[in-house]
Interface confidence: medium
């Protein structure tokens, strides 16, 4: 699996999408987990409804919510009020019994440009790259890690 990077602005919401083959994963619940180190376990953060037919219902754990479009084959995770400690490696998983298949490996990056938190004024000129009304809308960028990029930096 390649790692897909999702970037969100600190304090705003970030939506992570994990597409999958709806037929292959028919009847399976899904989960969102946080990777603990390169070789470590993936710690469950939140999972979809216990009844697969109700997977479309949003389930929440703290500031993280999950919902599954089982027909369209898209798992969506929303991280609200994104904070620097949310940055890190995650996985979207498809559950079957005690096993879990990885649907997508995700790197969440929290962007923290200080100008995003300034009132309109001296430096911040609305209209320069966006309108002031747009400033708090949910935005995200996703991209795949380039070949050769190291997803986990080597530990010293």
């Amino acid at each position: 699996h390649n790692t897909t990077v999702f970037q969100g602005v600190e304090g705003q919401s970030l939506q992570v999408s994990c597409p999958y083959d709806s037929m292959k994963h028919w009847g399976r619940r899904k989960a969102w987990c946080r990777q603990l180190g390169e070789k470590g376990p993936c710690q469950r953060v939140v999972s979809t409804h216990n009844l697969w037919l109700l997977s479309f219902l949003r389930r929440r754990n703290g500031s993280t919510a999950i919902t599954d479009d089982t027909l369209g084959g898209t798992l969506t995770i929303t991280l609200r009020n994104l904070q620097p400690h949310d940055a890190g490696f995650y996985q979207c998983q498809s559950l079957h019994g005690s096993e879990a298949d990885t649907l997508r490996k995700v790197l969440v990056e929290v962007l923290a440009d200080p100008l995003d938190h300034r009132d309109a004024g001296d430096l911040w000129v609305p209209g320069e790259s966006e309108s002031f009304e747009d400033a708090h809308v949910e935005h995200s960028i996703s991209r795949s890690l380039l070949e050769g990029e190291i997803p986990f930096p080597p530990t010293s």
């Epitope: 969100g8 602005v9 962007l111 790259s129």
Partner: antibody
Amino acid sequence: EVQLVETGGSLVQPGKSLRLTCATSGFPFSNVWLHWVRQSPEKHPEWVAHIKAKSDNYATYYAESVKGRFTISRDDSKSSVFLQMNSLKEEDTAIYYCTDILEYWGQGTLVTVSS
Amino acid sequence: DTVLTQAPLSLSVTPGESASISCRSSKSLLGVRDITSLYWYLQKPGKSPQLLIYRMSNLASGVPDRFSGSGSETDFTLKISEVETEDVGVYYCAQFLRYPYTFGPGTKLELK
């Protein structure tokens, strides 16, 4: 006129503590996220710590090199921000600036850690 | 961490001539909404850093328009079209996209 005035810097021995104060005026302090940035002699600036506003629950962040030793705090009623520095090391020797990391910077206060 | 490198580390310029300083980032500084979080500062001798350019190419308040910033996701340039005496000091690039915020090593500008 915007002013940030840092005080509290001095010569201390390794392992000791020091508390820096930054008194500000001339801008809406309570809304502004504030930082401490330090600069060792002949070196580039290094970001140290950051504190958000009340509306963000005064969330704090630290550079790895000071995590667990330094504590940033603020008093909105006094328009002041503080840096409590414990277990000081010789490599903490630097001029410490209080700043919004954009336009507003203090003149700095010198912290020297030496035996 | 995001590492910034600058070139040259020192620069000697005749007043009236142009000067160019390069800054390279180990990671892309292009964030959401196509905003590039690269900042330039000038630190005059014995003074605090002062902001020159924010978000790669925007001139900070009160900064003369002989200063300009440009670049891409990882490679950035600060240009001074006609260097003046008051431009002497150390120029730093800085990234404020990810914690920890980081600064470049600095480029010392002096006059010939």
